[in-house]
């Protein structure tokens, strides 16, 4: 969302969030590094380009032309300057001057060490509980943002962790019409359409690089969890990882895990719907988990096929139209999972990326909860690392994402909501170990293992 | 001026915990992550681990792991190291240091004079 | 968790000589590293951080070098006040451990 420093009355009115980086002569004297050549305060660019007729409310939603309902003025960084005032690297640099390359490596859960796991797990837990240091979240829309009194900014600080699930709330929110009036559903900024694997890379790159910082280790990395094992159990939902399930309620997590005193956040949808607000930073409930517990839906009881990713693979297309989930061999449709792993368009189907949630059964199996589960993480990681392989075999080949005429937030060149700076769908459609600084270690089906690179 | 003063040597016994502060000044702690580093007598440098401050997160090296605890009071701009269930092995010299995470700087770049604990029954 | 190895353990030099001390990492650290200098009976004393540059207030006789896994820390014409335990640091990956020391005697 945006920096805590913008999240005041004068930023939102000037519609200006240009954050000083070393203001050692006062206020305002070092907006985005510019005093140290790393930044300057520039003009928004926004997509403008028309968008598929699914949306059909333009002008109702804050989310629109994202940014510039709520700022038109940002940060523009130099070099390998990045960050919401120039005081970071683009993924993939690291130091003073941001000029030395460093690659970190995302691995298979499964494969760390006890003490690997410790750590990642004592990780999540700790963002979890640590307040983030840069963001703040709105808790109104945009018309209510100043309060009831028109004097008072509608922000929230809230958690490392719970940033990363508000994001993907906000991502893929109804759009409010109006008191009285039912909220439109059939919007979705970040699945759906060809933005999704872009979207959830930026996703996981953000939370990896805040946990970074929080942990003071610029190589920690997120592990994945390779969903494609074609059985009926979690082999990640272990005490010692993901936490096992509860002899007391088989939808709960164990009580010998950390996670099973996790509480959500972004779980009443009813109240923000009907009354137009925004998810907050309030905890509820606990997580609920009950993978392949679905007796009513057999075909969610078993994981993908090892040889669904290969299948998968072997798409050439990134996407097509009409650029949504019924698109026919698109490889983002097909990894996504509203695809047979072939790439023929089912709408009975539900396979990879999709059939995990949904073996899942539980807060994960639900679009605006999911990442509440931190599995959440490890299917994505596993999701982008498919995404990254396509990337390699294809020579990373953009021309099938559209330009214009996708679902609404899903053009190429739109900034994908809610993240902060401005970050455009092309900005990752990279290969990973080039151009993002972090690989995987993965062995696809009938390859030898390797490092991405 | 940035300072980092420990408190003074300690004999304990063994089995026994003691807690070791470390107050800083010239800098606000809540600015900084404070790291602790011990030296067994005659040896090299082990680190044991840093904390936050401002938000009481830590981390340790695992051999520390549950021995080790450190906590802070900002309002005193101060820091502890708490050492339970300790043995001879534990007798060294533990130092307090910050690390200045300005575009991440790889160093610790202040130091407390150590602290001696002497662990003997 | 990544080691370091530091060489040589000590060594012997007299004044105005270079000498080089090495830490190779178990891993690329990607410059991740400072030099300490300890004098017996003192606390270290910060000389380079991230691999090659000196700390405020450090005499330009010494100098930090390296990439990936290799780091050196060269001293040039060596003083007495030399004297002491040097120390290299990662900070690459947690744990952040330290080499093992090199003790330098001048003659």
């Known amino acids: 969302q945006f920096p805590r420093e913008c999240a005041n009355i004068e930023a939102l009115r000037r519609g200006v969030c240009c954050p000083d980086l070393l203001p050692s002569s006062g206020p305002g004297t070092d907006p985005c590094g510019s005093s140290s050549g790393r930044g300057r305060c520039v003009a928004v660019i926004a997509d403008s380009r028309p968008h598929s007729r699914h949306y059909p409310h333009d002008g109702k939603d804050d989310r629109e032309a994202w940014p510039l309902r709520f700022f038109n003025r940002t940060c523009q960084c130099n070099d390998n300057f990045s960050g919401h005032n120039c005081g970071t690297c683009r993924p993939g640099w690291r130091g003073a001057a941001c000029n030395q390359k460093i690659l970190t490596v995302r691995r298979n859960l499964l494969d760390l060490s006890p003490e690997e796991k410790s750590h990642f797990v004592r990780a999540l837990d700790m963002a979890k509980r640590t307040t983030h240091p840069q963001f703040v979240i709105a808790t109104r829309r945009l018309e209510d943002i100043l309060g009831p009194d028109g004097n008072t900014p509608q922000f929230e600080n809230i958690s490392v962790y719970n940033y990363f699930v508000w994001t993907h709330y906000y991502s893929v929110k109804k759009t409010f019409l109006g008191t009285g009036q039912e909220s439109f559903g059939d919007v979705d900024f970040s699945h759906e359409g060809p933005a999704f694997l872009t979207w959830h890379r930026y996703h996981l790159l953000q939370l990896e690089r805040d946990m970074q910082e929080m942990l003071q280790e610029p190589s920690f990395s997120l592990p994945y969890w390779n969903f494609a094992t074609g059985k009926n159990v979690c082999d990640v939902c272990t005490d010692d990882l993901m936490g096992s399930r509860s002899n007391f309620d088989s939808t709960l997590i164990s009580p010998n895990s950390v996670f099973s005193q996790w509480r959500v956040v972004c779980e009443s949808l009813e109240e923000y719907d009907t009354l137009g607000t925004l998810c907050n930073s309030t905890e509820g409930g606990p997580i609920r988990r009950n993978p392949a517990g679905n007796v009513g839906r057999p075909a969610v009881q078993r994981l993908p096929e090892p040889q669904d990713v290969t299948q998968c693979l072997e798409v050439r297309v990134f996407d097509t139209p009409p650029f949504y989930s019924n698109s026919t061999d698109s490889f983002r449709n097909t990894v996504e999972g509203y695809s047979a792993p072939t790439g023929k368009y089912d709408p009975a189907v539900r396979s990879l990326h999709n059939l995990a949630h949904l073996f899942l059964n539980g807060t994960g199996g639900q679009t605006h909860l999911s990442p509440n589960d931190p599995i959440f993480v490890l299917l994505h990681t596993f999701t982008d690392a498919v995404f990254d392989e396509w990337l390699r075999r294809y020579n990373a080949d953009i021309s099938t994402f559209p330009l214009e005429n996708a679902p609404i937030g899903h053009n190429r060149q739109y900034n994908m909501v809610p993240f902060w700076p401005p970050v455009t769908n092309t900005e990752m459609f990279v290969t990973a170990p080039d151009n993002l600084g972090y690989a995987y270690e993965v062995q696809w089906p009938g390859q030898e293992f390797t490092v991405s690179e | 001026e940035v300072q980092l003063q420990q408190s003074g040597a300690e004999l304990v016994r063994p089995g026994a915990l003691v807690k070791l502060s470390c107050k800083t000044s010239g800098f606000n702690i809540k600015d900084y992550f404070l790291h602790w580093v011990r030296q067994r007598p005659d040896q090299g440098l082990e680190w044991i681990g840093w904390?936050?401050?401002?938000?009481?997160?830590?981390v340790y090296d695992p051999k520390f792991q549950g021995t080790a605890s450190l906590t802070a009071d900002t309002s005193s701009n101060t820091v502890y190291l708490q050492l339970s269930g300790l043995t001879s092995e534990d007798t060294a010299v533990y130092f307090c240091t910050r690390r200045d995470y300005t575009y991440e700087k790889a160093a610790l770049d202040y130091w407390g004079q150590g602290a001696s604990v002497i662990v003997s029954s | 968790a990544i080691q370091m190895s530091q060489s040589p353990a000590s060594l012997s030099a007299s004044v105005g000589e270079t000498v080089t001390i090495t830490c190779r990492a178990s891993?690329?650290?990607?410059?991740?590293l400072a030099w300490y200098q300890q004098k017996q009976g003192k606390s270290p004393h910060l000389l380079v951080y991230d691999a090659k540059t000196l700390a405020d207030g450090v005499p330009s006789r010494f100098s930090g070098s390296g990439s990936g896994t290799q780091y050196s820390l060269k001293i040039s014409s060596l003083q007495t006040e030399d004297s002491g335990n040097y120390y290299c640091?990662?900070?690459?990956?947690?744990?952040?451990?330290f080499g093992s020391g090199t003790k330098l005697e001048i003659k």
């Open positions: 640091q990662h900070f690459w990956s947690l744990p952040f451990t």
């Open positions: 891993g690329n650290i990607y410059n991740y």
């Open positions: 904390i936050n401050p401002d938000n009481g997160n830590t």
